[in-house]
C-alpha cells in the first residue's frame, strides 16, 4: 500500500532509505532536454519473490529533439560531472547497503536521468535521518521514521532527532512548528505529520563516510 504522505522534514537533516520495500516505485525522470522513451514505463517498481527482490522495468531517456531513438548524446562538462557523481554514489552505495529480504537496493543510475529521484514509498518503509555537515545530532530516540497505516490513512512516525549547529549550546532547541494532526488520529500517535510532496531525492556525495555514504536531500 502506497504511503500517501511524506517523511517528516527535520531542520538541517537529510534522510535516506537503506533499502526499498517491495512495492516502492521510482519515477523515470529525465534531465532537461531528454524525455522518457515512448514505449518506456513511467516507473521502476521494486518487486520480488520469497528469495529475491529487484527493480522491474528500466528507465530510459532519449533526446527530446531525437525521434524514437535512444542515441547517446555527448554530455556537456557539467553534465559529465553530474553523471560521474551519480555513478560514484551508486558504486559507494553498494558497499554501504545491506541485503534485506523483501527489499531492493538503490537502483543504478540510467543515462541522462534527472538530478532528483522521486520515490513513492509503501507502508512499512523505514527512512533514516542524519544531520547535514556542520550540524550535530541530539538524539532522544531513534533517528528514523516509519510509514504506518491507521484506519486506512498513512502517516510517518516522528524521528527523535534534532540537529544543532556546532557553535550552538548543547540543549534541545525549539523544534519546528508541528503540523496539525489529521482528523481521527490522536496527537500522541501522530506527533507530527507532513503530507506534502513525494520523496524528491537529490543525490549528493557525502562529505563524511561516517553514517551515510550516499545521502539524500529532502526537497
Amino acid at each position: 500500500e502506497l504511503c500517501d504522505d511524506d517523511p517528516p522534514k527535520i531542520t538541517h537533516a537529510t534522510f535516506k532509505a537503506v533499502a526499498y520495500k517491495e512495492g516502492t516505485m521510482l519515477n523515470c525522470e529525465c534531465k532537461r532536454g531528454f524525455r522518457r522513451i515512448k514505449s518506456g514505463s513511467p516507473y521502476m517498481l521494486c518487486t520480488g519473490n520469497s528469495s529475491h527482490s529487484s527493480w522491474d522495468n528500466q528507465c530510459q531517456c532519449t533526446s527530446s529533439a531525437a525521434r524514437n531513438t535512444t542515441k547517446q548524446v555527448t554530455p556537456q562538462p557539467e553534465e559529465q560531472k553530474e553523471r560521474k557523481t551519480t555513478e560514484m554514489q551508486s558504486q559507494m552505495q553498494l558497499a554501504d547497503q545491506v541485503s534485506l529480504p523483501g527489499h531492493c537496493r538503490e537502483p543504478p543510475p540510467w543515462e541522462n536521468e534527472a538530478t532528483e529521484r522521486i520515490y513513492h514509498f509503501v507502508v512499512g518503509q523505514t527512512v533514516y535521518y542524519q544531520c547535514v555537515q556542520g550540524y550535530r545530532a541530539l538524539h532522544r530516540g531513534p533517528a528514523e521514521s516509519v510509514c504506518k497505516m491507521t484506519h486506512g490513512k498513512t502517516r510517518w512516525t516522528q524521528p527523535q532527532l534534532i540537529c544543532t549547529g556546532e557553535t550552538e549550546p548543547s540543549q534541545f532547541p525549539g523544534e519546528e512548528e508541528p503540523q496539525a494532526s489529521p482528523d481521527g488520529l490522536p496527537e500522541s500517535e501522530t506527533s507530527r505529520l507532513v503530507t506534502t510532496t513525494d520523496f524528491r531525492i537529490q543525490t549528493e556525495v557525502a562529505a563524511t563516510m561516517e553514517t551515510f555514504i550516499f545521502t539524500t536531500e529532502y526537497q
Epitope: E1, D4, D5, T196
Partner: antibody, heavy 116, light 106 residues
Amino acid sequence: QVQLVQSGAEVKKPGSSVKVSCKASGYTFTSYRMHWVRQAPGQGLEWMGYISPRKGYTEYNQKFKDKATITADESTNTAYMELSSLRSEDTAVYYCARGGGVFDYWGQGTLVTVSS
Amino acid sequence: DIQMTQSPSTLSASVGDRVTITCSASSSISYMHWYQQKPGKAPKLLIYTTSNLASGVPARFSGSGSGTEFTLTISSLQPDDFATYYCHQRSTYPLTFGQGTKVEVK
C-alpha cells in the same frame, strides 16, 4: 467538519479549457494530498492524479498527463484542476477527494460538458 | 497498470437477500478498498484495507480476500443499499477502480 466544495457545472466548446476548483475546509489543507477522479456519464471512476498542496508536487495518471494540470493555492485552501484542449470525450463529472490514504472525503463533483 | 475486474456488472436482488460482489486484480495487491455511490452523488468510503468498515457503515457490510481476489458481502440487503459499488486499489500508481457493480431492485 471536513468539507470539499467544488465549483459549478460548466459547458465548454471543443478546443477550449476549463478550470475546476475544490475549496477545502475543516482540516489543515497542507497536511493532505488532494486527488482528482473523473467519471464519464454512465461510466466508472478513473484516478487522474494528485497535488501535495504545500510543495505543489503533482503526480499524474499517464492517461491524463497532457490533459490535466493540477494546482493548489494555500492561501485560500483551494485545489484546482485545469483541463485543456477539450473534446466531447472529456464530458464527465470531476471529483476532488482528500488523500492521505483512502479517500474519506469527496467534493460534490463538477459536471463539465463539452459540446459545440 | 493494475486492472480491476468486478463481477457481476449488474446484480438484481430483493430486500433481505445476501449479496456478494467480487473484484479481481490483474496483479497481487496488499489491500482492497470499497466505495458506494448513489446516482448524482459522490462516492462514499464503505470498506478500507479489505475488511474494515468505514465510520457509520452498518455491520451488514463485510469485506474479505487477499492477493488478487476480494469480496464485498451484504448479509441482508436493505432499501438504502441499492447503489453502485466500486473496488479500488492504491498499492501502485496509477490508482485504479473496478468498473462498478450496480445493485438494483429485482
